[in-house]
């Protein structure tokens, strides 16, 4: 019996087609992805093959103005329109709190939403009961397939799930659910979830009875043969893991941003064992036409977005200096504003010993593309912020050793004075440079804000200590020459859309007046 698994993950509000780098589409003839194009390809496959499941491995939420405005209603509507069969909860599904998950998505989705390792307690337990499930048995033709969900147990540090959801260890939580499916005579089981490729592989290895793992979170691109675009494969598709009980378990993921549609064909024997598995992600490029009906619907929903862009988010009573003359040479108040917003967006009081889990922010000055003039009645709009942060990036959470941070700050000024983008703006950091010294030895003082303290204060950076830092995904991926971050990071979790982070902060503060205050000397 043959099953076709179509899968997406980490779509992050890319409902419309995008450029090849998943930013805003500028030249339509070269654009990719989007739900209208995805639907065309999905329908093509549904028409050609008998047993097809369309699955999503989480993080539909967060990433563009679509999410900012529609808050998840767009996800439910278009996933329903595409007739998804199941979705696993990702960490970003909790970005607007549990209510922001329940109302727009859980109550509106026609498909099951899954996670076996999230357990509700207290008053939430009855409110959320039945709205998400640990597993679902799906009939496919004359057979049945069990889908069991999982979500990153780091979610409380990455999003806003509140205090009434417990995120258990994935493997510990999955095993009894898979065992239950086996007692129900379900012998074909897919683990669908959002914990990253390393955990996906562990699940394939450790959870007895799981036949296939469909993952997300780490934006992993797997491919067999010559890859069709810019993404470099982390391995073959599917990635085969030998389980502890000797089975060959295919593990797949489909990069991110709706650029690819994962396509995996699995052949099962009559006892539900995987005989063979093959496939590849399908690049959703302009050779695949956008479905006119879905496209028309997208255009209808788009209208509200254009109106939103020009509405006032808040006010500034000072000039927000985002000029390259400032931000690439010295501390600039736009950099301070953005870093303050980044830390504010990551306030998670999950431990009494810590005032917060993260206190530090770094931001490449070259990523700040425009100032905002306060003389326009002080008004700040989404449109203004889109000029400051035009690249559609995210502000991510990484874990770095102090020694890596020291290298990063040396790189920040290794060729100071040439108006290059690697000059770092900061938050929760006090850095002193001596530019008379030779490159690689210019950082004379580097103090960082404590986290394990009730009164935050600055302490010298310790080379061997591991620190959490918020930074743009561009830096996490080694951009602007920060190869040491990419090579030496110990953990990387993608965060919220950059503009959304700053706009939320401005809306919360209502009136802002960021100063230059001696963070960089």
């Amino acid at each position: 019996w043959e099953l076709t698994i179509l899968h997406t993950n980490d779509v992050h509000s890319r409902l419309e087609q995008t450029s090849e780098d998943s930013s805003k589409c500028v030249n339509a003839s070269r654009c990719m992805g989007g739900v209208a194009r995805l639907f065309t390809k999905v329908q093509q496959i549904r028409r050609a093959e008998p047993n097809v499941l369309l699955l999503d491995a989480g993080d539909q939420y967060q990433g563009t103005i679509w999410f900012t405005v529609y808050k998840g209603a767009e996800v439910a509507h278009f996933m329903n329109a595409l007739r998804y069969d199941a979705m696993a909860l990702g960490n970003h599904e909790f970005d607007n709190g549990v209510e922001g998950l329940i109302e727009p998505l859980l109550k509106e989705a026609k498909f099951p939403i899954l996670s076996a390792n999230i357990k509700a307690k207290g008053p939430l337990a009855s409110q959320i009961s039945g709205l998400y499930l640990p597993y679902k048995v799906l009939p496919v033709g004359d057979e049945v397939v069990g889908i069991v969900g999982y979500t990153s147990k780091e979610t409380p540090f990455l999003s806003n799930p509140g205090t009434n959801l417990v995120f258990e260890d994935e493997i510990t939580a999955l095993q009894p659910e898979v065992d239950k499916l086996k007692t129900l005579n379900v012998n074909k089981i897919i683990a669908l979830g959002h914990s990253g490729f390393e955990m996906d592989k562990l699940i394939a290895q450790k959870v007895r009875g799981v036949d296939v793992v469909v993952g997300g979170h780490s934006n992993t691109f797997l491919y067999t043969g010559n890859p069709p675009s810019k993404e470099v494969p982390a391995g073959k598709y599917p990635f085969i893991v030998t389980s502890d009980d000797g089975r060959k378990v295919p593990v797949v993921q489909a990069y991110a941003f709706g650029k690819y549609l994962g396509y995996l064909k699995i052949e099962f024997d009559e006892r539900g064992n995987v005989i063979s598995s093959h496939g590849n992600p399908i690049l959703l490029n302009s050779s695949i036409p956008e479905d006119p009906s879905i496209k028309a619907d997208i255009n209808k929903w788009r209208i509200k977005l254009d109106n939103y862009s020009t509405q006032e988010l808040g006010k500034t009573i000072v000039y927000l200096d985002g000029s390259s003359q400032s931000c690439r040479f010295r501390e600039c108040n736009m950099g301070n504003l953005i870093c303050d917003a980044m830390i504010n967006n990551n306030l998670r009081h999950t431990d009494e010993m810590f005032w917060n889990h993260v206190s530090m922010c770094i931001l490449n000055g070259g990523g700040i593309r425009s100032p905002i003039d306060e003389r326009n009645n002080g008004t700040i709009t989404w449109e203004n912020l889109a000029a400051v942060l035009p690249f559609g990036g995210t502000f991510d959470l990484v874990q770095l050793k102090g020694s890596t941070l020291k290298k990063a700050f040396e790189h920040s000024v290794h060729r100071y004075g040439q108006s290059t983008g690697e000059f770092l703006q900061v938050g929760g950091i006090h850095v002193v440079y001596d530019l008379s010294r030779k490159p690689g030895d210019r950082v004379v003082k580097l103090d960082v804000l404590c986290t394990k303290c009730r009164v935050p204060s600055y302490d010298p950076l310790k080379m061997d200590e591991v620190y959490k830092v918020i930074l743009p995904n561009f830096l996490a991926n080694g951009g602007d020459g920060f190869q040491m971050i990419k090579d030496e990071l110990l953990r990387h979790d993608s965060g919220d859309q950059d503009i959304n982070v700053v706009s939320t902060y401005i809306s919360k503060m209502k009136v802002i007046y960021p100063a230059v205050e001696g963070r960089i000397k």
Partner: antibody
Framework: QVQLVESGGGVVQPGRSLRLSCASS????????MHWVRQAPGKGLEWVAV????????YYPDSVKGRFTISRDNSKNTLYLQMNSLRAEDTAVYYC??????????????WGQGTMVTVSS | DIQMTQSPSSLSASVGDRVTITCRAS??????LAWYQQKPEKAPKSLIY???SLQSGVPSRFSGSGSGTDFTLTISSLQPEDFATYYC?????????FGGGTKVEIK
């Protein structure tokens, strides 16, 4: 082979009740949504009810809502339509039809031969 | 409710003719449209689903097209066994609704 066979039709007085059955064979009945569709003499097709594969949801058009109840017994591979408060306009051939394997609306790939229901005094 | 309007309601054609039947939905239904053939005193038979997919066992002279609100069923070369009534049906949302039918008669 895949087959649907309806039974239980007949002549009934207005206001009375009737129960139709549809026996299935040749496929995994419990995996499919099942529908009733009717056709009044000389008229077109009208959808009457659906029950999802797991009985989790049932849907009806306004014309029969509150009067007709669809049910299924997966252990017997049988679909039912309980028709109460019958009216003259319910006179039709009633077909049972197989839908899809999910909770989304679907088309019908397999049809029974139909059973005639006549509501007349 | 979504109304389905079929045209023409009847047509006369000869064996070998190309026949086109149209179906219009009162609102967008994407490609969630099916076509059925019904002969007198018989149950309907599924021809096409998802607007353009041929049900297995259906001759390739039948084809469907369209998306959104406008759909077409085409019989490329009418055969004697094709004289029947044809219905479209939307399955975008409940309640499921059918077109009024198109009777294809021998000229």
């Amino acid at each position: 082979q895949v087959q649907l066979v309806e039974s239980g039709g007949g002549v009934v007085q207005p206001g009375r009740s009737l129960r139709l059955s549809c026996a299935s064979s040749g496929f995994t009945f419990s995996n499919y949504g099942m529908h009733w569709v009717r056709q009044a003499p000389g008229k077109g097709l009208e959808w009457v009810a659906v029950i999802l594969y797991d009985s989790s949801n049932k849907y009806y058009p306004d014309s029969v809502k509150g009067r007709f109840t669809i049910s299924r017994d997966n252990s017997k591979n049988t679909l039912y339509l309980q028709m109460n408060s019958l009216r003259a306009e319910d006179t039709a051939v009633y077909y049972c039809a197989r839908g899809g394997s999910s909770w989304y609306p679907d088309s019908f790939d397999i049809w029974g031969q139909g059973t005639m229901v006549t509501v007349s005094s | 409710d979504i109304q389905m309007t079929q045209s023409p309601s009847s047509l006369s054609a000869s064996v070998g003719d190309r026949v086109t039947i149209t179906c219009r939905a009162s609102q967008g239904i994407s490609s969630w449209l099916a076509w059925y053939q019904q002969k007198p005193e018989k149950a309907p038979k599924s021809l096409i689903y998802a607007a353009s997919s041929l049900q297995s066992g259906v001759p390739s002279r039948f084809s469907g097209s369209g998306s959104g609100t406008d759909f077409t069923l085409t019989i490329s070369s009418l055969q004697p066994e094709d004289f029947a009534t044809y219905y479209c049906q939307q399955y975008n949302s409940y309640p499921l609704t059918f077109g009024g039918g198109t009777k294809v008669e021998i000229k």
